[in-house]
């Protein structure tokens, strides 16, 4: 008789196979700024605005930031985005030893994204792998979904776009 909690045989269940996102695929399969994904745009955050304090810098040494502007802007993001990104950084290193997560765009103050981009409020990041091997980006997108980003889009040959719900809507949903 087998007692509770006992496992028959010594074989462990193989890890679930991760299916890469296809180019131009997004998950969940709804528009980014809808309730089932990252939710509505709440307005641009400027350095001078009161809401700027909602953004927190990410100094995770396991993440490489492109920081083309040399301002540190790409490191700024909401706490929810930071948590998901840090989780993804671990997944990337586990998936590809010697490779790190790389952020090409985070919070943007330059205004070169689309009109109501979540980059303007620190809720979106564009990511690649540190080796910039584009063959990896489909799987990187899947890892981002698994890391808990609220919307992931294999947007470009050159990057994967990830975004999160606002702190307010996320807190209301979890009751925290």
């Amino acid at each position: 008789i087998i007692g509770p909690g006992r496992v028959v045989g010594s074989r462990r269940r193989p890890p679930r196979k991760l299916v890469p996102l296809a180019y131009k695929q997004f998950s969940p399969n709804v528009p980014e700024k809808t309730l089932g994904a990252s939710g509505r745009y709440e307005g641009k955050i400027a350095r001078s605005s009161e809401r700027f304090k909602e953004l927190t810098p990410n100094y995770n040494p396991d993440i490489i930031f492109k920081d083309e502007e040399n301002t540190g802007a790409d490191r700024l993001m909401t706490q929810r985005c930071k948590d998901r990104l840090n989780s993804l950084a671990i997944s990337v290193m586990n998936q590809w030893p010697g490779v790190k997560l790389r952020v090409t765009e985070g919070w943007d103050e330059d205004g070169h994204h689309s009109e109501e981009s979540l980059h303007y409020e620190g809720r979106a990041v564009d990511i690649t792998t540190s080796d910039r091997d584009r063959n990896k980006y489909g799987l990187l997108a899947r890892l981002a979904v698994e890391a808990g980003f609220d919307w992931v889009y294999y947007e470009s040959k050159a990057h994967v776009h990830c975004s999160v719900k606002s702190e307010h809507s996320a807190a209301a949903k979890t009751g925290g």
Partner: antibody, heavy 123, light 105 residues
Amino acid sequence: QVQLQESGPGLVKPSQTLSLTCTVSGGSINSGGFYWSWIRQHPGKGLEWIGSIYYSGNTYYNPSLKSRVTISVDTSKNQFSLKLSSVTAADTAVYYCARGQDSGDYDWYFDLWGRGTLVTVSS
Amino acid sequence: SYELTQPPSVSVSPGQTASITCSGEKLGYKYVSWYQQKPGQSPVLVIYHDNKRPSGIPERFSGSNSGNTATLTISGTQAMDEADYYCQAGDSSAVFGGGTKLTVL
């Protein structure tokens, strides 16, 4: 609309430094997303990218020319410049300044070009 | 260093379709642009992002890119399309193809 205009000497002596300036009018060189670039074309030949600079000062150079090239930006004058040192006759070419845009992660394309200026290297 | 290869010349009759190819290792993973240059003039961007047309460029210009080959297609070619065409791709170092002379017979 944005326009680019190259300026500088048309004749440079061998071993000297070639210096060109590109003036941007009708728009700010500080605009994010643009890579201000230099491209040259030897007489009767194809195009060769020399290098690009972002308004923040980050520079990107053709590996084959890197040791001799310096590109700088002067945001106050809305200009960017090229310096190519130790020139030889092989550097004789039409030099274009151009505005690069990024399709992705350094996937540049050049949507605006100056008229070009012929620089001859000769003693 | 990365190289892009184009045929030196392509000929086409007026009204016909001209195809100019550009090949490079894993080119499909990169974004390709195409430029038209007429004698004595600066290059003009005709296709970017593999298949997008800048404003002012006629609809007869189209592009595609997959595998190791990108293609510029000019449908209903006109005499005014006679020019040199250059493909270009980048990866922190912009690279141009050698150019293709398009002759409209």
